[in-house]
């Protein structure tokens, strides 16, 4: 028979107030015959937590049937954990003897400490939108965790980021800790549908990290590109001019037409479409009456996007004599 080993697999056990803690202890041999006891602490002042042989321990239950000779699992559960329960717990084998049992071997001990889960990470983006190719900062905060050791990672669309700084406070001993991390993210034109994720891993989470997210759509402004074109076909005495506003975000947009510098009040037809990347296209049609027009008509499509300075595109209308004749012919 191999020499008895007392196995306490966890060096550290984090528990939550009010919950039940399981302290594991297994033996590698059924010899020598004798009881297993649990103590908190070492030396003469150690506190008896459980004695399989005798005594009343209302908060302690055993994981397996300790009355059986062939039992090798001496794990216990302690219910209704309080801060007073913290300490190092030892599983100790005794050899049957008289007048008292003789201590034979102790396990290495399991430190029980109070653990607190971190709060769900909150990710905050920049206060103002920024255009692609620029860098924006996101902050992630999580609070109330213990112990202090914690891992925080940043991801953009599943790809881990490396440009971030993290602080855990306070630096000294505390009941609970907070983490704050700031990541720098370079915006891409297609980031309207992108997400940044802050992932927090802590021992209390048992391998299931907490995540906080922020949508880059809240941080990005993709400015539009403008194109004004004259349609080759005319309708009666009118020429159709199109202003195409492409690839912009957010949707907030004001478009105005001007004829030779005069803002036109009349309504125009328009359509808004959403692109796969989350940006928008806006197409506006402007009908110009050419029957009484001179040759030098200049149309301007002016766009004010998301409160930014207006951008505009001009088009000098081409109206041939033939077109004029046609239009006057068509006029009743």
């Amino acid at each position: 028979e191999e020499e008895l080993q007392m196995i306490q697999p966890e060096k550290l056990l984090l528990v939550t107030v009010g919950k039940t803690a399981t302290l594991h202890c297994t033996v590698t041999s059924l010899l020598p015959v004798g009881p297993v006891l649990w103590f908190r602490g070492v030396g003469p002042g150690r506190e008896l937590i459980y004695n399989q042989k005798e005594g009343h321990f209302p908060r302690v239950t055993t994981v397996s049937d300790l009355t059986k000779r062939n039992n090798m699992d001496f794990s216990i559960r302690i219910s209704s954990i309080t801060p007073a329960d913290v300490g190092t717990y030892y599983c100790v084998k005794f050899r049957k003897g008289s007048p008292e049992d003789v201590e034979f071997k102790s396990g290495p001990g399991t430190e029980m400490a109070l653990g607190a889960k971190p709060s769900a990470p909150v990710v905050l983006g920049p206060a103002a939108r920024t255009t692609p190719e620029h860098t924006v900062s996101f902050t992630c905060e999580s609070h109330g965790f213990s112990p202090r050791d914690i891992t925080l990672k940043w991801f953009k669309n599943g790809n881990e980021l490396s440009d971030f700084q993290t602080n855990v406070d306070p630096t000294g001993q505390s009941v609970a800790y907070s983490i704050r991390s700031t990541a720098r993210v370079v915006l891409d034109p297609w980031d309207v549908r992108s997400q940044v994720i802050c992932e927090v891993a802590h021992v209390t989470l048992q391998g299931d990290p907490l995540r906080g997210t922020a949508n880059l759509s809240e941080a990005i402004r993709v400015p539009p590109t403008l194109e004004v074109t004259q349609q080759p076909m005319r309708v009666g005495n009118q020429v159709n001019v199109t202003c195409q506003v492409r690839k912009f975000y957010p949707q907030s947009l004001q478009l105005t037409w001007s004829e030779n510098g005069n803002v036109c009040q009349r309504e125009t037809a328009s359509t808004l479409t959403e692109n796969k990347d989350g940006t928008y296209n806006w197409t506006s049609w402007f009908l110009v009456n050419i029957s009484d027009q001179r040759d030098d008509v200049v149309l301007t499509c002016q766009v004010k996007h998301d409160g930014q300075l207006a951008v505009s595109k001009r088009l000098a209308l081409e109206v041939t004599v033939h077109q004029k004749d046609q239009s006057s012919d068509a006029t009743p």
Epitope: Q52, K53, R69, K96, S98
Partner: antibody, heavy 118, light 107 residues
């Protein structure tokens, strides 16, 4: 069902030999210490021998050197080889399992009678 | 060897009585003491181990106490099936030894 069944008892002359068997079932035989206990007619119980899970054996002075306890875990069997039998060895022989954590007996067989007489 | 002495050797009692049997060890045996019940022609039955722990399936009318050298077995309310011979046994060290028995008879 946990069970112990002894066999091999009978009538033997003084100086003779006998081998008792105990068939175990319903539990992991190799994980328990096993004992023999005897009881002469109208008398009290007397512990005869033990074989531990590691094969270690112990006997009282009254049978030491004459009796040998052994076990065959693969067959879930316990044996007691009794040599140089005396009239005073006449008794019902029980096998018992040291089934409690502290090796207290928890299960007993029904017993087998050994009579040593000329 | 450790000597175990039971008293009384025999005891008469009536149905419903509470009876106590004592067992004394010749030296300290901690609390490694067991109690057994035996009926005529039958194998012993385990009742109590570690002085006060009830074996599985044993009714709670049986109780044990004691530590060191002096131990007791108490049967709280005698029923017809309880009339038998009772043995104590020390199992702190080899050779394990039994008391001489206490015969509990119906009055």
């Amino acid at each position: 069902e946990v069970q112990l069944v002894e066999s091999g008892g009978g009538l033997v002359q003084p100086g003779g030999s006998l081998r008792l068997s105990c068939a175990a079932s319903g539990f992991t035989f190799s994980s328990y210490d096993m004992h023999w206990v005897r009881q002469a007619t109208g008398k009290g119980l007397e512990w005869v021998s033990v074989i531990g899970i590691a094969g270690d054996t112990y006997y009282p002075g009254s049978v030491k050197g004459r009796f040998t306890i052994s076990r065959e875990n693969a067959k879930n069997s316990l044996y007691l080889q009794m040599n140089s039998l005396r009239v005073g060895d006449t008794a019902v022989y029980y096998c018992a399992r040291g089934g409690s954590w502290d090796d207290a007996f928890d299960i007993w067989g029904q017993g087998t009678m050994v009579t040593v007489s000329s | 060897d450790i000597q175990m002495t039971q008293s009384p050797s025999s005891l008469s009692a009536s149905i419903g009585d509470k009876v106590t049997i004592t067992c004394r060890a010749s030296q300290d045996i901690n609390n490694y003491l067991a109690w057994f019940q035996q009926k005529p022609g039958k194998a012993p039955k385990s009742l109590i181990y570690t002085a006060s722990s009830l074996q599985s399936g044993v009714p709670s009318k049986f109780s044990g106490s004691g530590s060191g050298t002096d131990f007791t077995l108490t049967i709280s309310s005698l029923q017809p099936e309880d009339f038998a011979t009772y043995y104590c046994q020390q199992y702190v060290s080899y050779p394990y030894t039994f008391g001489q028995g206490t015969k509990l008879e119906i009055k």
